[in-house]
Interface confidence: medium
């Protein structure tokens, strides 16, 4: 039968004052010689030689410092042998516990932790969790870490709290404002012995990035703008509208979208945003007509590309800016409108018979021009004559068989209207279908003066072809689009300047 005792030993200190730390004895020693042997970790396995036994008395001594963090306890395997080396008892397991001392500081898993949190987050929102360990005995005061924020930069007012037990960092309030501070740095101390004065400590840094939300309403630099634009012109840079937004630059929370509230029902204008500068460029994409509209009021609003944050939804009121547009009259003078007309000449029409009228319209009045003279331009087979004052077209002579054959039954000539004051010439195209010469060619005795377009339909108000390529370098506050100042003249292409 074994008789035994074992005391605990304390790590990191001289335990020899407790020797013998353990003692074993077999009652077989009453009638024979017994040799005691021990083995195990701390004896014949690393760390070697911590425990030694007096083979005769069974006293076990400890020889050096022990580390609980290496071996929290020792199991000493004990044997009682007779003189032949045979076991007298079943081997005994003797357990020696190592008592913990606070010889390990807390260790943070990182020297610097990184976290992020949206501005305006509610109080008590989790930002990050710090991780620290202590190698001392688990579930013991020596390894119980208490966390504490010891410094915050910027230090204006404390914005974060830490759970002393879990290391969770949360928002203290809902006042985080990226536009004020985009980042916070915290210094956190972890102290074992649950933060007691006798504990060991370690520190770490926490870098907390404040993420932007769309909590700033964009606004235009000016509440009203005044511009002038020439009629009949396009302009790709009529007005620059700068938008101010305090949210994170170049993010969707900052990028503006300017839109029309009213006044652009005719879709004359577009606003194109420059996403690098948050400037809106007002463009004329459809020409204005002074005769139809001398001025107009545009009302514009601004919002962001991103939705507004819920925290400002209730504050958002659509705030309009006004653009007063003055349309400048351009002396447009006479033009042929339509620029091409088709007539019919029958076989029974003769010299001085009327083919039709081709009159230039004064675009400034919308009525037939009274300031032009008409002359024939290209006149194949010298077929027609024009009245220089009225624009009346007549046959010079009855159409001959030779003329008919030469023209293939189709005439295409031009008429010119010349305004000597404006030094402007306008060209109209005359198309004539010459009816074939047959037995019944005298049946149509009336001169055919029905005017049709070159599609064969009745006269239409087919509009002029506009040149839509425009450039402008004008960026003054009152905008003008006179030709040569960045705007393109859009009078019809059958108008020519010069004598």
């Amino acid at each position: 039968e074994w008789i035994k005792f074992a005391a605990a030993c304390r790590e990191g200190e001289d335990n020899s004052k407790r020797n013998p730390i353990a003692k074993i004895h077999s009652d077989c020693a009453a009638n024979q010689q017994v040799t005691y042997r021990i083995s195990g970790v701390g004896i014949d396995q690393p760390p070697y030689g911590i425990f030694v036994i007096n083979q005769k008395t069974g006293e076990i001594n400890i020889t050096s410092i022990v580390d609980r963090e290496v071996t929290p306890f020792f199991i000493i395997y004990c044997r009682a042998l007779n003189s032949m080396g045979q076991d007298l008892e079943r081997p005994l397991e003797l357990r020696v516990r190592v008592l913990d001392i606070n010889d390990n500081p807390p260790v943070f898993s990182m020297a610097t932790f990184a976290g992020q949190i949206e501005e305006n987050s509610n109080a008590n929102t989790l930002v990050m969790i710090l991780n620290a360990t202590d190698a001392d005995e688990p579930n013991n005061l020596n390894s119980k870490i208490a966390f504490k924020i010891i410094r915050q930069e910027p230090s204006d007012s404390p914005m974060f709290i830490i759970n002393r037990n879990t290391g969770e960092i949360r928002t203290m309030n809902n006042f985080l404002d990226r536009e004020q501070y985009g980042q916070y740095a915290l210094a956190v101390r972890g102290s074992d012995r649950d933060g007691g004065a006798d504990g060991m400590s370690a520190e770490c840094e926490c870098n907390i990035k404040i993420l932007d939300v769309n909590d700033n309403i964009p606004y235009m630099e000016q509440s009203s703008y005044t511009i002038e634009i020439q009629e009949n012109t396009l302009n790709s840079n009529l007005l620059e509208i700068r938008v101010i937004d305090l949210d994170e630059e170049f993010s969707a929370n900052w990028m503006a979208v300017i839109f029309f509230i009213s006044g652009n029902e005719g879709n004359w204008f577009e606003i194109e945003m420059n996403e690098r500068t948050n400037v809106g460029i007002l463009k004329v994409v459809k020409p204005l007509d002074y005769e139809a509209m001398q001025s107009l009021q545009l009302s514009i609003g601004v919002r962001n590309k991103a939705e507004f944050h819920h925290s400002i939804m209730s504050q958002y009121k659509l705030k309009a800016s006004a653009i007063s547009v003055t349309v400048l009259n351009v002396i447009e003078g006479p033009v042929f409108r339509p620029g091409s007309k088709t007539y019919v000449v029958t076989g029974n029409m003769g010299s001085n018979d009327k083919v039709g009228d081709f009159v230039a319209t004064d675009l400034d009045t919308g009525r037939p021009s009274t300031t032009v003279r008409y002359v024939m331009g290209n006149n194949p087979a010298d077929l027609l004559a024009v009245d220089s004052r009225t624009g009346k077209l007549t046959l010079k002579n009855k159409v001959t068989k030779e003329q008919y054959n030469m023209l293939g039954g189709k005439y295409q000539g031009t008429i010119l209207s010349i305004d000597d004051n404006l030094q402007r010439t306008c060209t109209g195209t005359i198309n004539i279908n010459i009816q074939s010469f047959g037995n019944d060619d005298r049946t149509n005795t009336e001169p055919n003066t029905k005017i049709t377009t070159n599609t064969g339909r009745q006269e239409s108000t087919s509009s002029t072809n506009y040149d839509t390529s425009t450039t402008s370098t004008d960026s003054s506050q009152v905008y003008s689009s006179e030709p040569g100042n960045g705007a393109k003249d859009l009078l019809s292409d059958n108008v020519h300047f010069g004598p």
Epitope: S16, P46, P47, V52, T63, S64
Partner: antibody
Framework: QVQLQESGPGPVKPSGTLSLTCGVS?????????WTWVRQPPGKGLEWIGE???????FLNPSLKSRVTISVDKSNNQFSLKLTSVTAADTAVYYC????????????????????WGRGTLVSVSS | QSVLTQPPSVSGTPGQRVTISCSGS????????VYWYQQLPGTAPKILIY???QRPAGVPDRFSASKSGTSASLAISGLRSEDEADYYC??????????FGGGTKLTVL
């Protein structure tokens, strides 16, 4: 289980600096051991260079002390040796080892031994 | 020149008993534990004896050691061919730090 692996740049020129690193895998360098460098010139015996504890405490061989630096890098779980002003006499196989070093209590001697060794790396010093 | 003195070589035939000596002074062997290492060809050393005379688990009982004053000795009985290796004694010196013997080459004939 814990393993040690020496690594270094290879040959070193005379008067140059020998630099070696020992990586500790399968365990923490912050455990309560002394991390040791031992060398063995070709065909000769073992020579203790020095040892370091994870807190930076060192014991160095007095005959090499002026030329030796041993450092520990806890974040990478490794320790290093720097030996300056080398000569051909510093050509050797360099071993890193895990040491136990315990001062004995009253009446008991000191424990000092190595229970785990790296494979060793040969460093030649030649021009 | 090693601090601890060992014979450069010893030899023996299989089954024989050989002894390797290690002598020093009071500052190391005289006051601290002696350790013995075995280094098989081309490998790192491994511990053979700790605390003067104790065998680690796994070391055959053919190996034994003792210490007396400032000298120590390692005995190998029942010699086998796999015992052919270099053997080193080592101890801590309170002034010089760790010291090794010069090593003894054991040849099994």
């Amino acid at each position: 289980q814990v393993q040690l692996q020496e690594s270094g740049p290879g040959p070193v020129k005379p008067s140059g600096t020998l630099s070696l690193t020992c990586g500790v895998s399968g365990g923490s360098i912050s455990s309560n051991h002394w991390w040791t460098w031992v060398r063995q010139p070709p065909g000769k015996g073992l020579e203790w260079i020095g040892e370091i504890y994870h807190n930076g405490s060192t014991f160095l061989n007095p005959s090499l002390k002026s030329r030796v630096t041993i450092s520990v890098d806890k974040s990478n779980n490794q320790f290093s040796l720097k030996l300056t002003s080398v000569t051909a006499a510093d050509t050797a196989v360099y071993y890193c080892a895990r040491g136990w070093h315990r001062t004995g209590f009253r009446g008991y001697p000191s424990h000092w031994y190595f229970d785990l060794w790296g494979r060793g790396t040969l460093v030649s010093v030649s021009s | 020149q090693s601090v601890l003195t060992q014979p450069p070589s010893v030899s023996g035939t299989p089954g024989q008993r050989v002894t390797i000596s290690c002598s020093g002074s009071s500052s190391h062997i005289g006051s601290n534990y002696v350790y013995w290492y075995q280094q098989l060809p081309g490998t790192a050393p491994k511990i053979l004896i700790y605390s003067n005379d104790q065998r680690p688990a796994g070391v055959p009982d053919r190996f034994s050691a003792s210490k007396s004053g400032t000298s120590a000795s390692l005995a190998i009985s029942g010699l086998r061919s796999e015992d052919e290796a270099d053997y080193y004694c080592a101890a801590w010196d309170d002034g010089q730090g760790g010291v090794f013997g010069g090593g003894t080459k054991l040849t099994v004939l």
